[in-house]
Structures are given as structure tokens and as C-alpha cells.
Interface confidence: low
């Protein structure tokens, strides 16, 4: 009988304590927001906001420019000065709540917690491969804004998400803000609004459309906007909010809100509950039917999927899928089952479910007792009636009013609970070759790059490494610049290659050569490495 090498256990073929050093930038304060820009003439930039300051970095993460965004009332505040001679409001620090690109101009828009949540527009000026910010424009017209009606009050100190959409020649800002009674009383930001940026950059056009939590619910009904994105004909917001206006406000669930990206209207505003569960292969006694619910969304990202995952999700390759990391509650603390689970919601399926929900509400035969919902935004009513009305009048359409779809969209953990104790705090999904990879940041400052596949009893790691020594949580927002992802942790920004930081964590030649093609790994004497790391022989096709 032939002698065979003893099999190395899979886990023993890699070492996740291997240190990788990736390029980084120290921002000088807790990173509050970050966004990247790639121009069509090879120029690129990373914009990093901390309290009272905005940094402009080159593609190598070297500082190119720095701008003082606060404190408001301080003579050194460069953005404040763009609004002309003050005072413009109470003095105070500026925490950046919104940092987005308007790609059409192109320009960077920043909005802070000070000065009624107003925004500033910074035109981008390419200089070689780097980018500079032009002098900021103050997006605030004093004569247009009142405490009860303020088109230029965009950012809420409690958090705001913005997605910019080009419609014709105009830029529309789809804005979602968390409110409470105090914030709502001060220059009245709205929960959800669509605002047109005025062509002369003096602010936003008045008369914008908006939905807001009704005053009577502001104290108890808090909506957290976790993520927003634009794909196809729609803009989507993802929220964590109480499951009911009338019941326990601490019983939370996750919703997807859909708005038209082609018409700046809110009549076709729709919400759908997203239900993510952990369903172990073998159900324990007493475990809930259908799996354990993970109702609270922590982070999300949408991306087109590779062939393998597409097949598993029964969709076409390249179709857009919304990925979410969910936890059991706000604290995300330990319970039975894993700390974090990942669910995948194909966008086309989401849209179909929403459209079917509209049909159920608006088409005969009428389903008795079917509520229009969204009672925190509008007067209660039953389908097909408009909010607050007993019946449809002949010249109104059931479809032209906001609606909560009556069914939810259920999915189970793609990783089958294998994330275990890991608390995921950041997520970005990419397609590499035909592989779909989840790039995840964790509560303890690590990066996990894992292939997204179902039905395995182990995780397929591209990498699992520590970003630095601080062990601080990786922040929610991740940006891409070329073939790199930018993660923030504490006061640092880190640049992580999407192909992984290297190959040294693969300990055996067999495991090294079975790494994904895109990682570029080969056996190099006695270690796994990329060709540039190997002065001598580098073997990609067979082991010695």
C-alpha cells in the first residue's frame, strides 16, 4: 500500500496572527466620515473628516490639503467664512454628518452638526494625479430659511444619510435624518426628503418634498438610517426602527425604504420589512421555527454578485444584491448563536415584493383590514384609501401615497452561523473573477475577507488580519479607490487591497496554491507569497 502524507487539518494550514502592515493615514482625531473620488484623467483623492477638519489625501494617503470646518463662530473656520459675515448661529464644534460626492460637477459636499446642519460645496480641482478643493460655497440662503421651513437645513446631529442622484441637468439630494423632538424643533430637518441643489450653489430649492415623523411620535419613535444607495430606477434607505408605533419602542426591526430616482416625488415611497435569521442545520429543542431572528441591521452594502453566489441565490451573474450584517439587538451582545449573521437580498426580488404589495393594497378585490401603514409619517388608513381618508375620491390614485408593504422579506444567514463570536462593524462586497468577497471590519479592529458562499461548514478566508495595535472598532463606512478599500478605525484610515494584503498567512504549499487566482499567491522556498516578495524561485503550478 502506497504511503501518503498525513492530511494537514484545514485550520492548521493558515495563521491569522501573521502581521500585515497596510498603508495608513493618521487623521488627528476620530474619523467621522470618508469618501473617495476617481476622476477620468487618472486623478484621485480620499476625503477624510474629523471634528472641525476636513483632510484631502492623495491616492498614496499622503496629505494634500486640510480645511478647517469648525468650530462655528471661530475666526479660523474656513467653511463658515464662505457664508459671509456672521454670526450664523450658536458657536460650537462641527461634527461631519454628511460627506458625499456630487459626481456631475464634480464636487464634494460636506454637512455638519453646526450652523443648522447646513452644507458646503467644494468643487474638485485636479492637479496631476491629486485633487484639491476649491474655496467652499455655502449652501445656505438666509432669506429662504425659517425655523419651520428650512430647505438648506440638511444634516441632523443624530445622523443623516445622503445619496446624490443626477436627473437631467440637476442634482437631487435624497436625504434621510434621525430626529427627536429637540432636533425637529430646531430648523425642522425632515425624516426623508428630496432636495434639488440650486444651479448657483446658493443652497437647495424651496418647496421640496418630504416625510417626517409626526410630532406626537417624535419622543418614542426613533428611526436610525443605517445605509443608503442608488441602483437602477430607485434610491433605497435602510433603517432600524421600532416594529410598532404603539408597542414597545425597544422592539426593533429593519426596513428598506424605496424612493423613485427618476421623479423627485414621495407618492411612490414604499417600505418593506427585512427579516434575517440564523437557521442552524440541526435545530435545538426550543429554538424558534424558521430560525432565530436577527432583527437589527448593523451595516449593509449592495453589489453585483459573481457567478457562483448568483447560482446559489438563483439569480443571474452580475445582478445587484443587498448584503446586510444583522445582530439580535442594539447592543449586539452575545446570546445563543453567532453574534453577527449575513443575509443577502437580491434587489430585483425586493422590488417584486414591493410591487406585489402595492397591487395587494390598490387592486381589487380589496383585502379587508389591510393597513397602509407608516402611521409614524401619516394618518392611519386602510387600503386602498389615502392616509386619513375613509375612501378614495375619483381623482386620486391609491398608488400615489406612501405604503408599508404588508409582507416581509425573509432570508437566512449565508455563513450558517460560522462568524461565531465575531462582531462585524463594517461591510463592503466586491466581485473578483467569478467570486463574491465580503470585506468585513470587526469590533476588535480586524479585517476579514471571506468568500460569500452558502452551504459550507467552514469559512473560505481570503484574509483575516489585525489593522493595527489599537484594537479599536472598524467604522461602518468603507470606500473603494481603485483596487483598494479604505477602512477607518479610531483616528486612522487604512488602505487594504481587495485581493487581500498578502499570502503569508497560508502555511502550507498545498493551501497556498489553492488560494484564489486573484490573490496572486505562489510558493516561495518555504513560504507563501506574491511574486514581488520572492527574490528566488516562485512556483504557482506545483509544490516541491
Amino acid at each position: 500500500e502506497d504511503w501518503q502524507c498525513p492530511r494537514t487539518p484545514y485550520a492548521a494550514s493558515r495563521d491569522f496572527d501573521v502581521k500585515y502592515v497596510v498603508p495608513s493615514f493618521s487623521a488627528g482625531g476620530l474619523v467621522q466620515a470618508m469618501v473617495t473620488y476617481e476622476g477620468d484623467r487618472n486623478e484621485s483623492a480620499v476625503f477624510v473628516a474629523i471634528r472641525n477638519r476636513l483632510h484631502v489625501l492623495g491616492p498614496d494617503l499622503k496629505s494634500v490639503q486640510s480645511l478647517a470646518t469648525g468650530p462655528a463662530g471661530d475666526p479660523g473656520c474656513q467653511t463658515c467664512a464662505a457664508c459671509g459675515p456672521g454670526p450664523h448661529g450658536p458657536p460650537g464644534d462641527t461634527d461631519t454628518k454628511v460627506l458625499v460626492l456630487d459626481p456631475a460637477l464634480p464636487a464634494l459636499v460636506s454637512c455638519g452638526s453646526s450652523l443648522q446642519g447646513r452644507c458646503f460645496l467644494h468643487d474638485l480641482e485636479p492637479q496631476g494625479t491629486a485633487v484639491h478643493l476649491a474655496a467652499p460655497a455655502c449652501l445656505f440662503s438666509a432669506h429662504h430659511n425659517r425655523p419651520d421651513d428650512c430647505p438648506d437645513c440638511v444634516a441632523s446631529p443624530l445622523g443623516t444619510r445622503v445619496t446624490v442622484v443626477e436627473q437631467g441637468q440637476a442634482s437631487y439630494f435624497y436625504v434621510a435624518s434621525s430626529l427627536d423632538a429637540a432636533v425637529a424643533a430646531s430648523f425642522s430637518p425632515r425624516s426623508v426628503s428630496i432636495r434639488r441643489l440650486k444651479a448657483d450653489a446658493s443652497g437647495f430649492a424651496p418647496g421640496f418634498v418630504a416625510l417626517s415623523v409626526l410630532p406626537k411620535h417624535l419622543v418614542s419613535y426613533s428611526i436610525e438610517y443605517v445605509h443608503s444607495f442608488h441602483t437602477g430606477a430607485f434610491v433605497y434607505f435602510l433603517t432600524v426602527q421600532p416594529a410598532s408605533v404603539t408597542d414597545d419602542p425597544s422592539a426593533l426591526h429593519t426596513r428598506l425604504a424605496r424612493l423613485s430616482a427618476t421623479e423627485p416625488e414621495l407618492g411612490d415611497y414604499r417600505e418593506l420589512v427585512l427579516d434575517c435569521r440564523f437557521a442552524p442545520k440541526r435545530r435545538r429543542r426550543g429554538a424558534p421555527e424558521g430560525g432565530q431572528p436577527y432583527p437589527v441591521l448593523r451595516v449593509a452594502h449592495s453589489a453585483p454578485v459573481g457567478a457562483q453566489l448568483a447560482t446559489e441565490l438563483s439569480i443571474a451573474e452580475g445582478q445587484e444584491v443587498l448584503f446586510g450584517v444583522f445582530v439580535t439587538g442594539k447592543d449586539g451582545g452575545p446570546g445563543v448563536g453567532p453574534n453577527s449573521v449575513v443575509c443577502a437580498f437580491p434587489i430585483d426580488l425586493l422590488d417584486t415584493l414591493i410591487d406585489e404589495g402595492v397591487e395587494r393594497c390598490c387592486e381589487s378585490p380589496v383585502h379587508p383590514g389591510l393597513r397602509r401603514g407608516l402611521d409614524f409619517f401619516q394618518s392611519p388608513s386602510f387600503c386602498p384609501n389615502p392616509p386619513g381618508l375613509e375612501a378614495l375620491s375619483p381623482n386620486t390614485s391609491c398608488r400615489h401615497f406612501p405604503l408599508l408593504v404588508s409582507s416581509s422579506f425573509s432570508r437566512v444567514d449565508l455563513f450558517n452561523g460560522l462568524l461565531g463570536p465575531v462582531q462585524v462593524t463594517a461591510l463592503y462586497v466586491t466581485r473578483l473573477d467569478n467570486v463574491t468577497v465580503a470585506h468585513m471590519g470587526t469590533m476588535d479592529g480586524r479585517i476579514l475577507q471571506v468568500e460569500l458562499v452558502r452551504s459550507l461548514n467552514y469559512l473560505l478566508y481570503v484574509s483575516n488580519f489585525s489593522l493595527g495595535d489599537s484594537g479599536q472598532p472598524v467604522q461602518r463606512d468603507v470606500s473603494r479607490l481603485g483596487d483598494h478599500l479604505l477602512f477607518a478605525s479610531g483616528d486612522q484610515v487604512f488602505q487594504v487591497p481587495i485581493q487581500g494584503p498578502g499570502c503569508r498567512h497560508f502555511l502550507t504549499c498545498g493551501r497556498c496554491l489553492r488560494a484564489w487566482h486573484f490573490m496572486g499567491c505562489g510558493w516561495c522556498g518555504n513560504m507563501c507569497g506574491q511574486q514581488k516578495e520572492c527574490p528566488g524561485s516562485w512556483q504557482q503550478d506545483h509544490c516541491p
Partner: antibody, heavy 119, light 107 residues
Amino acid sequence: EVQLQQSGAELVKPGASVKLSCTTSGFNIIDTYIHWVNQKPDQGLEWIGRIDPADGNRKSDPKFQVKATITVDTSSNTAYLQLSSLTSGDTAVYYCARGYGNLNAMDSWGQGTSVTVSS
Amino acid sequence: DIQMNQSPSSLSASLGDTITITCHASQNINVWLNWYQQKPGNIPKLLIYKASNLHTGVPSRFSGSGSGTGFTLTISSLQPEDIATYYCQQGQSYPLTFGGGTKLEIK
């Protein structure tokens, strides 16, 4: 009901100026754009320019930049088109129209003002 | 400026016919194309916006299609009240420009 009411026909001499008005009702003028379009006898439509009443921002065809000035008075919901240094070639019907969202489409039109330039 | 070329410039058809008018843009205008109808002695009226969206109150026998540089307006089952001149107009960039018009007559 959305309406755009234009001022009456004008007969003017070459070299003179004229100011046409367009008074809107049934909607808030600052929530839309107001466009001006002309149509010469037995010819097609020609875009002159538009104004954003919310902030007075104007866009116009370069060939009309000297000839035409668009203004707005939001307090009276009225847009104006001033035409200067008129020649017989400026004889046309001038329409104001409401912008449809930001699609650069015009969904409601005034009845038109006929301007005849003749000595 | 973006040129809009409309063809044919005139067209004669019988009641009940289906007719097609085409509009070609000199550069890519995505879907930012609008169609108008102007009946003799009347003001223009918006028929279709953003290439294929029927404006409120416009009969469903009118339809629009296309994107990029090529667009069509189709009228199925021609009616007497469809006698008019039809114009396309691009909304992609300033200055906005119209096609030269297509005059539709009934045989």
C-alpha cells in the same frame, strides 16, 4: 388648474424693445423652471432660455444672450422676456412654458404672444 | 450644441394606420428626449417625456422609445384629431434644442 397667461400681441418698430409677461397660477412658481420658446411664421420651435424662479438662475441659448433677457417677479408669480434691438427677423410667436420637474421638458404652455416687427 | 434631426419632415397616412416618426441626436442624450404635439393654430402640448413616459392625459396610442442617439414616436390607430406637427426636444444639455418637426396629414 395650472395656467400661464401671457400678455397681448405687440406691434413694434425695428430697433425698439419689448417686454413680454407670463403670469402663472395653479402652482408655486418657485417650485419650477419657466422656459421661453419662439416660433417664427411657418417654422419650428426654438428654445430661447429658462429661469429658475427660486434663485433667478438663468440658462439661455448663446444666440439669444444679447437679444433676450429673462427675469421673474416671484411676488406676482410673473416671468418676463425682454427683447431688444428688434428686427423683422424677430417677428414670431413667443411662448412661456412651465418646466416639468427637472427633466427639461415643458408640460404647460402659455397661449403665446405675437410680436410683429415692422416699420 | 446638440442637433436634433427629425424625419420625415412631412407624412401622409390613413385613419387607423400606425405611423412612426424618428429623431436622431448628434450626440448621446441618454433618455432625455421629449415629444410635443402642435395642432394647427394651437400651442404645443407635451406628449412624452424622458423618451418613453406618457404625459398625463395623453392617449395610450402614443408611445415613445429609444435611448442614446436614436428615438421614435409611434402613433397606432391614427385618429383625425392626431393631425398636427410633432416635435422632438433634447433635455440633456443646454441650450435645449428641438427637431425641425414632422407635419402629419391624413390621406
